[in-house]
């Protein structure tokens, strides 16, 4: 039991596969931990060994590669299940070693069940489509390497529970599903079922992804500040609470970072001594356009505070904008007994 570089349990690669379907799982060592590939390792005389720990057990045990019909097999750096069973769930370890070198990593494999409408605990990838774009395609994911190019599988696409046929703007084209002039009603879960033969048996691969229709870049605009604006004046007496909302609309932009911030006399609130709090809320439209509101609050405003410049700033990948709030000190109403009486000549 000489020392082995143990990369531990790689929970980043939480692998989920469907019950009773083929699964091919590559040893993560070569993809994420080592600087060389399997072929190089194999040429150097290193051996790849697989073992596993069943769910709710502590005991590591070798994988049985002598099951009927070679249900579990290893090919190069890939562990194959043809097909999976529910009790294959557990932590799997691949270890690369020879007499002088050893490196290993474990990863969790979860075999999940699905119902007749493809609902399951499987975490679904999200594919974003732009609204109204001409033609956009999604591709049946993670099916490479399951069958040779000489095999022509049959692919059936479903939206939710329904087979896609004669949908007006969603067209199955083999491994691809085309969306013509996508609308929000195209949002949903899409499933491809790939059926292929192997050694006299028929296997099915089920892949589901979520389609989310989002705002199109052709309609995207720089941030729009709805508040503060020129129509609203924040008129306060010293001692009152000053509340100024900064409300900004951001068009959806893929991978854009939307930012809103206040400056007071040109400085960030953190950099000044007055007691300011800022609360932010975010809401999204159906096409993932974003509205951010940051409320600037000064509990007991002073006459000095009412002379300051309060500017709301916003930035996205489309540009940067700023708008100053109109803040002024309220002129106190005259007190009748003194000021008005004097005005009427009373002594």
């Amino acid at each position: 039991s000489e020392r082995c570089d143990d990369w531990g349990l790689d929970t980043m690669r939480q692998i989920q596969v469907f019950e009773d379907e083929p699964a091919r799982i590559k040893c993560p060592l070569f993809e994420h931990f080592l600087k060389f590939n399997y072929s190089t390792a194999h040429s150097a005389g290193l051996t790849l060994i697989w073992y596993w720990t069943r769910q709710d057990r502590d005991l590591e045990e070798p994988i049985n590669f002598r099951l009927p019909e070679n249900r579990i097999s290893k090919e190069k750096d890939v562990l194959w299940f043809r097909p999976t069973l529910l009790n294959d769930t557990g932590n799997y370890t691949c270890m690369l070693r020879n007499t002088t070198y050893c490196s290993k990593v474990a990863f969790p494999l979860e075999v999940v069940q699905k119902d007749s409408c493809f609902n399951s605990p499987m975490k679904l990838p999200v594919h974003k489509l732009y609204i109204e774009y001409g033609i956009q395609r999604i591709t049946c994911p993670n099916v490479d390497g399951y069958f040779p190019s000489s095999v022509k599988p049959t692919i059936t696409w479903y939206m939710g529970c329904y087979k896609i046929q004669n949908f007006n703007n969603v067209i199955p084209e083999g491994m691809n599903l085309s969306f013509l002039i996508a609308l929000i009603s195209n949002n949903g879960n899409y499933t491809c079922v790939v059926t292929y033969p192997e050694n006299g048996r028929t296997f099915h691969l089920t892949r589901t992804l979520t389609v989310k229709v989002v705002g199109s870049p052709k309609n995207a605009v720089p941030p729009v500040i709805h508040s503060p604006n020129d129509h609203v004046v924040y008129e306060k007496e010293p001692g009152e609470e000053l509340l100024i909302p900064c409300t900004v609309y951001f068009s959806f932009l893929m991978d854009s970072r939307n930012e809103v911030w206040w400056t007071i006399d040109g400085k960030k609130p953190d950099d000044i001594t007055i007691d300011v709090t800022i609360n932010e809320s975010i809401s999204h439209s159906r096409t993932e356009d974003e509205t951010r509101t940051q409320i600037l609050s000064i509990k007991k405003v002073t006459s000095e505070d009412l002379k300051r410049s309060y500017v709301c700033h916003a930035r996205s990948a489309k540009g940067e904008v700023a708008k100053a709030a109109k803040v002024k000190q309220k002129v106190p109403a005259p007190r009748y007994t003194v000021e008005l009486a004097c005005g009427f000549g009373a002594t």
Epitope: E132, Y133, G134, I135, N168, L180, L183, I184, S185, K218
Partner: antibody, heavy 118, light 107 residues
């Protein structure tokens, strides 16, 4: 001011062809989806076809699929409808209209009459 | 396809009165519903989109409500220029479909 002006209508025999045009002005044509809607004499409105702003995506009503082709030339600000294998039931006023997903057909042309008769 | 059904087919109203037009969708169209007005010999004109938002230049006497499958267009006080045919249209799913129209005529 947004303007859409259809042309190309007329009398055609069953089985014949016609090409309608719609000249657009007053807005950035290349950023809007466009469509054709028709209205048979004394009847209601029927959506015929739509095309995406870039011309790549095209959709058709089942009643015209395989016979009509929608297209656009963004450099000329013009929308087209090529109508082949025309039938008597295609007789209608054909309107072109622009659309956005949140406002539907917000501007319409004045229409052009297509009459299919022997 | 989604079938849009309008009622009544004809509505007889006196000028100054209120008119209420109904539109029903065969399945939910969310709030993706538009109302159009069409006068004889003219193209349709967009009145309402998003079920309740008035289009540019449309007078406040026109209002829309509803979501899902049931929608209403209300004209609060009919003017002489409002006598026309009104169509609802869903734009939630392709193909976009229209109702058969409601004719608002002078009583």
């Amino acid at each position: 001011e947004v303007q859409l002006l259809e042309s190309g209508g007329g009398l055609v025999q069953p089985g014949g062809s016609l090409r309608l045009s719609c000249a657009a002005s007053g807005f950035i044509f290349s950023t809007y989806g466009m469509g054709w809607v028709r209205q048979a004499p004394g009847k209601g409105l029927e959506w015929v076809s739509a095309i995406s702003y870039d011309g790549e995506g095209t959709l058709y009503a089942d009643s015209v699929k395989g016979r009509f082709t929608i297209s656009r030339d963004n450099s000329k600000n013009t929308l087209y409808l090529q109508m082949n294998s025309l039938r008597a039931e295609d007789t209608a006023v054909y309107y072109c209209a622009r659309f956005r997903y949140y406002t539907a057909f917000d501007y319409w042309g004045q229409g052009t009459l297509v009459t299919v008769s022997s | 396809e989604i079938v849009m059904t309008q009622s009544p087919a004809t509505l007889s109203v006196s000028p100054g009165e209120r008119a209420t037009l109904s539109c029903r969708a065969s399945q939910s169209v969310s709030s993706n519903l538009a109302w159009y007005q069409q006068k004889p010999g003219q193209a349709p004109r967009l009145l309402i989109y998003g079920a309740s938002t008035r289009a540019t230049g449309i007078p406040a006497r026109f209002s829309g409500s509803g979501s899902g499958t049931e929608f209403t267009l209300t004209i609060s006080s009919l003017q002489s220029e409002d006598f026309a045919v009104y169509y609802c249209q869903q734009y939630n799913n392709w193909p976009w479909t229209f109702g058969q129209g409601t004719k608002v005529e002078i009583k």
